[in-house]
């Protein structure tokens, strides 16, 4: 007859490494008499005999985890007790090793140029995987804008057009490598006008083509507005190449108009818009067209505030749906263009433009605009702005003064009334009157009319030959 013997664990539990979905076994060999009862715990919680995820064999000495999950990680203990002496226990750890797995892969992203983009790449694995990124066919290099975050996500600050492309993340540890699917980063660019339409001064019944070129991502659409409304007549031709759209509007001109090119593209739920405006004016008005529709009112704008005669009434042309707005936008566009001209020319040109676009007005049954006096127009053209005028004259339509793609709506001096014929029929430019007070160096002008000073000019210009047409009495 055997003598009773307290349990002794002859093979203590060891740390077991196991891969996910593989089998892991703990051995707890016990010598004792009588045969002991063996129980198993994981993290001090009893493993039930009927738990189908486990197999307990060899009288409880063998614990097998049939398909390891990452949540099986922990401390496993076996306890043997046969009523003789005390119970004995041995413990060992299960370390679940895991090939890299991408739990939150990157997704396709559309982002506006200049914003921040984040492509996610969350991983699992043991040992912890390292994450790198591939753009196109080559490894992505980090720099001051581009960084791989601790989480594995890729962050790109101030996204540029060249960041667009296909990306994938790579998770790697000692057990293997995982690749995400390729995702696309699309960089959207706000609509921008590359070439604004140019203004034209044409005869009644002419054909004019206005051209507007815009760029953006996605490629913008271009629409045309005539005096605040959608263009009602005229044909539009469009051409798209790369990310550039070129739109040409052909018009048959029967009335003056303000034409606006609007380039629009969509970014998610939002739109970006760029605008450029041009005028089409009619050079020679026939008698019937001269009875122009318009009204006299106070000038409320900003651009010409310092130039126009204080508290005078000016003419607003109702061929525009909102004359005040249209004329102010025109003068604003023209004014910006004057930043490039000489200090001598600029104030004179500003005076000319403001008094041309906002002509002094005589209210009455038929409100009548008063054009600028020819002599003042010629003084600006051939004295103050002679150099600028000559430089531009060869490159432009008659009656238009352009610089680059922009325009200045300047009157044709020869068509204006002379102050000598009817001093009440035209407007003087106060700026020029003011300047002529200070003249000491300019030669006197001989004319059949009384001799008069010309607007002030530097001494170096005193050798100019000046025609009597300028004399301002």
């Amino acid at each position: 007859e055997k003598l009773p013997k307290a349990p002794v664990i002859t093979t203590p539990l060891e740390t077991v490494d196991a891969l996910v979905e593989e089998v892991a076994t703990f051995m707890c060999a016990v010598e004792s008499y009588p045969q002991p009862e063996i129980s198993w715990t994981r993290n001090k919680i009893l493993i039930k005999l009927f738990d189908t995820r486990y197999s307990i064999r060899e009288n409880g000495q063998l614990l097998t985890i049939l398909s390891v999950e990452d949540s099986d990680d922990g401390i496993y203990c076996c306890t043997a007790n046969n009523g003789v002496g005390g119970a004995v226990e041995s413990c060992g750890a299960l370390q679940v090793k895991m090939k890299p797995k991408i739990t939150r892969p990157p997704i396709n992203v559309k982002i506006i140029e200049g914003l921040k983009a984040v492509l996610p790449c969350t991983t699992m694995g043991n040992p912890k995987p390292s994450v790198s990124w591939i753009k196109g066919d080559s490894a992505l290099r980090e720099n001051s804008r581009i960084a791989v975050l601790e989480s594995g996500s890729l962050r790109i600050h101030n996204v540029q057009k060249e960041d667009a492309g296909q990306y994938r993340c790579v998770a790697k540890n000692s057990l293997g490598t995982a690749y995400s699917k390729l995702v696309k980063l699309e960089v959207e660019v706000f609509a921008r006008i590359l070439r604004a339409p140019e203004s034209h001064n044409v005869t009644f019944g002419s054909f004019v083509t206005l051209r507007c070129t815009a760029i953006g991502m996605p490629v913008p659409t271009i629409s045309w507005i005539e005096n605040g409304n959608a263009v009602s007549s005229g044909s539009i031709q469009e051409n798209v190449k790369d990310r550039v759209i070129d739109s040409r509007l052909q018009l048959f001109i029967t009335k003056p108009g303000l034409y606006t090119c609007i380039a629009t593209n969509k970014h998610g739920e939002k739109f970006s818009t760029a605008k450029a405006a041009a005028t089409v004016s009619i050079a020679e008005w026939s008698k019937s067209q001269k009875e122009s529709k318009g009204y006299c009112a106070q000038y409320r704008g900003e651009v010409c505030d310092a130039v126009l005669v204080k508290d005078s009434l000016v003419f607003f042309n109702t061929s525009y749906p909102d004359p005040e707005e249209a004329q102010e936008l025109l003068i604003h566009t023209a004014w910006n263009e004057l930043k490039a001209v000489s200090p001598l020319c600029r104030p004179a040109a500003e005076a000319l433009l403001c008094n041309h676009l906002f002509q002094e007005c005589s209210p009455g049954v038929l409100p009548t605009p008063m054009p600028i006096c020819r002599e003042y127009c010629l003084a600006v053209k051939e004295l103050f702005c002679a150099k600028e005028w000559l430089a531009m004259e060869g490159k432009t339509h008659r009656g238009l003064y352009r610089s680059g793609m922009h325009f200045l709506p300047v009157p044709e001096c020869s068509k204006l009334p002379s102050m000598h014929q009817d001093p009440t029929a035209c407007t003087r430019l106060p700026y020029l009157d003011y300047k002529k007070e200070n003249i000491t160096t300019f030669p006197s002008i001989t004319s059949s009319k009384p001799s008069v000073d010309i607007p002030n000019l530097p001494a170096s210009t005193s050798s100019f030959a000046v025609s009597p047409a300028y004399s301002m009495t």
């Epitope: 409320r300 900003e302 508290d311 005040e324 604003h332």
Partner: antibody, heavy 121, light 112 residues
Framework: EVQLLESGGGLVQPGGSLRLSCAAS????????MSWVRQAPGKGLEWVSA????????YYKESVKGRFTISRDNSKNTLYLQMNSLRAEDTAVYYC??????????????WGQGTLVTVSS | QTVVTQEPSFSVSPGGTVTLTCGLS?????????PDWYQQTPGQAPRTLIY???SRHSGVPDRFSGSILGNKAALTITGAQADDESDYYC????????????FGGGTKLTVL
């Protein structure tokens, strides 16, 4: 839909300062003149200041000249009113209002809900 | 200093017509003052009705119309309704010396 949302109002002591902001949405902010209009409790409307679309010029009611400064940040779609040397008579609801066009003095065609400024010791 | 004048109060019967006026303490109101009209109900922000003398703001019923009557700007409401009971303000562009915008004192309209 045009929306104007004023903020920055509150209680301030005489001589103190406040900066009101007006966040605009639903229209191309940079294409419109803007104004501040105030209304003292139980009183009528009083125009305070105006600024055109590009902010080049600024206009003020005589009694606030030198104390108030209107400005705009078209990139942020925001209008501001910096109010210094505040007086008891500046107590009012301050409305931000959109002008009908680019110029500073077009009609006021959209209004915010207002922010209350109380100047009291 | 020029003051913009309005009737302090006015009453009208439902369905009736009323004309509110806006004048200057010295001088006449002209279209160069670009008269604007605003409606305000208690506790609410103002609402634009008429701008530049006679242009109706979008969404404003055609019962409201603006004009120059003699030397004053006028707002006429035809077929008055109960919800027209409000304060009405005119606004004028003023341009002597420096640019300015001035509101009238307002007219309290009661629909009896």
């Amino acid at each position: 839909e045009v929306q104007l949302l004023e903020s920055g109002g509150g209680l301030v002591q005489p001589g103190g300062s406040l900066r009101l902001s007006c966040a605009a949405s639903g229209f191309t902010f940079s294409d419109y003149g803007m104004s501040w209009v105030r209304q003292a409790p139980g009183k009528g409307l009083e125009w305070v200041s105006a600024i055109p679309w590009q902010g080049g010029s600024t206009y003020y009611k005589e009694s606030v000249k030198g104390r108030f400064t209107i400005s705009r940040d078209n990139s942020k779609n925001t209008l501001y009113l910096q109010m210094n040397s505040l007086r008891a008579e500046d107590t009012a609801v301050y409305y931000c209002a959109k002008r009908s066009g680019r110029i500073a003095f077009g009609a006021l065609d959209a209004w915010g809900q207002g922010t209350l400024v109380t100047v009291s010791s | 200093q020029t003051v913009v004048t309005q009737e302090p109060s006015f009453s009208v019967s439902p369905g009736g017509t009323v004309t509110l006026t806006c004048g200057l303490s010295s001088g006449s109101v002209t279209s160069s003052n670009y008269p604007d009209w605003y409606q305000q109900t208690p506790g609410q922000a103002p609402r634009t009705l008429i701008y530049s003398t006679d242009s109706r703001h979008s969404g404003v019923p055609d019962r409201f119309s603006g004009s120059i009557l003699g030397n004053k700007a006028a707002l006429t409401i035809t077929g008055a309704q109960a919800d027209d009971e409000s304060d009405y303000y005119c606004g004028l562009y003023m341009y002597s010396g420096s640019k300015n915008y001035v509101f009238g004192g307002g007219t309290k309209l009661t629909v009896l």
